[in-house]
């Protein structure tokens, strides 16, 4: 009977996961006479297989990071090998999984800051990247300070934004921070997927050495 | 080895028919289709249809299809091809092929019947 | 129809020498899964047809590989290396890309 997984040739959208072990089949084709066979031509990167009788499957695990989208052909042929049907397109999407990891683009950043620069504005940037879908949560990437050293009465001189990775002053740091007392500071910056949500995400660190500069500024003198 | 033989030759009046076999050997006769080529004297090749002996499907030229008849029988292993309303013009070599199946080609041939069409 | 055409309709050859025969077809006999269907075979004097290259470049079981084919979607080419006395005979190139399938006119090679 048809339904589902069989019915005649036509154009078609299936949606698979990446990484799953092939385990069923993605369609059965049926021929309407002269048809006797069926060709599968297109992006099926020797994964793809049609079988004499119109069986559509897959042999490996699919990688979305290698093909997001594997545009296919099918025609029915007779049996003299002539297109008697199609060829029709048939588009498989592949899901993604989070099979990878966030990575911050370098293993240390340096940077400066001016004391009593203004809390909230940037003064670096940290970046990570992660192969995965970024309009899926196993793309989606958070920023956080794990250590700020040294720490000062436990207070944080500095933040980042979740989001974009960007490095500023706390409102604590533009009014404490004093190079004559530290000089320096060296933040741990971790970056998670799964928009830091989960317990499955993956993370990476990266090493931020920050230089506290002098103020110069003087105020005018009344 | 595989092999197509073919009947032997026919004189026809114009306006009769005439039926031409071809016995098939050496492979499984249902897996391939078997085709009809002509080839009248001094000209080309014409190709005048097929068989598929599976399911008896059959496909004519359009020149040939009111005129023309391509049966089997697997019993047998034979294919035949019927022309009728014959004409001084159907005068020819009559050839059948077999069409390998997954290669597309014509690997063998008969030895051909010479058909005569003449009052 | 896809009209196949042939040149020269004549080829007189030196044995040991090569030669060339071309055919032409008026639509291209490529497809998509990247076959081209076009098939060479030669008719020996009183024999029946027996076939030479097929899928324009696959040469035949049994065929020597002083013969090959080659081309594009609509022009092709059989080649012979070193010309033979037994390779005297009628060459046909065929289109079997659709139906109805249709010949060249033929290439008559015969020895100088």
């Known amino acids: 009977q048809e339904g589902k997984f069989s019915g005649p040739l036509k154009p078609m959208t299936f949606s698979i996961y990446e990484g799953q072990e092939p385990s069923q089949i993605i369609f059965q084709f049926k021929a309407n006479p002269p048809a006797v066979t069926f060709e599968l031509t297109g992006e099926t990167d020797n994964i793809f297989v049609i079988e004499r009788e119109g069986l559509l499957y897959y042999n490996r695990a699919l990688d979305r990071e290698t093909r997001s989208t594997h545009n296919l052909q099918v025609a029915a042929l007779d049996a003299n090998g002539i297109i008697v049907e199609g060829p029709v397109p048939i588009t498989i999407k592949v899901k993604d999984i989070n099979d990878n990891r966030p990575t911050f683009l370098q293993s240390k950043y340096e940077g400066s800051v001016r004391q009593n620069s203004r809390p909230g504005k940037p003064f670096l940037y940290v970046n990570a990247t992660d192969l995965d879908d970024p309009a899926t949560p196993n793309g989606q990437l958070y920023y956080q300070i794990v250590i700020q050293l040294p720490m000062i009465n436990n207070v944080m001189y500095f933040q980042i934004n979740n989001k974009t990775g960007a490095i500023s002053l706390t409102r604590e740091g533009s009014q404490e921070l004093n190079p004559a007392k530290n000089p320096s500071y060296n933040l741990v910056i971790s970056v998670k997927d799964m928009g830091g949500q989960s317990e499955n995400s993956f993370s990476d660190t990266t090493s931020v050495d920050i230089i506290v500069t002098e103020n110069i500024w003087k105020a005018p003198k009344p | 080895q595989v092999q197509l033989v073919q009947s032997g030759a026919e004189v026809k009046k114009p306006g009769a028919s005439v039926k031409v076999s071809c016995k098939a050997s050496?492979?499984?006769?249902?897996?391939?289709?078997i085709h009809w080529v002509r080839q009248a004297p001094g000209q080309g090749l014409e190709w005048m249809g097929y068989?598929?002996?599976?399911?008896?499907?059959?496909k004519y030229n359009e020149k040939f299809k009111d005129r023309v008849t391509m049966t089997t029988d697997t019993s047998t292993s034979t294919a035949y091809m019927e022309l009728r309303s014959l004409r001084s013009d159907d005068t020819a070599v009559y050839y059948c092929?077999?069409?390998?199946?997954?290669?597309?080609?014509?690997?063998?041939w008969g030895q051909g019947t010479t058909v005569t069409v003449s009052s | 129809d896809i009209v196949m055409t042939q040149s020269p309709l004549s080829l007189p050859v030196t044995p040991g020498e090569p030669a060339s025969i071309s055919c032409r077809s008026s639509k291209s006999l490529l497809r998509s899964n990247g076959n081209t269907y076009l098939y060479w075979f030669l008719q020996k004097p009183g024999q029946s047809p027996q076939v030479l290259i097929y899928r324009m470049s696959n040469l035949a079981s049994g065929v020597p590989d002083r013969f090959s084919g080659s081309g594009s979607g609509t022009d092709f080419t059989l080649k012979i290396s070193r010309v033979e006395a037994e390779d005297v005979g009628v060459y046909y190139c065929m289109q079997h890309l659709e139906y109805p399938f249709t010949f060249g006119q033929g290439t008559k090679l015969e020895i100088k």
């Open positions: 068989i598929y002996p599976r399911d008896g499907y059959t």
């Open positions: 050496g492979y499984t006769f249902t897996d391939h289709t």
């Open positions: 092929a077999r069409f390998y199946y997954g290669y597309w080609y014509f690997d063998v």
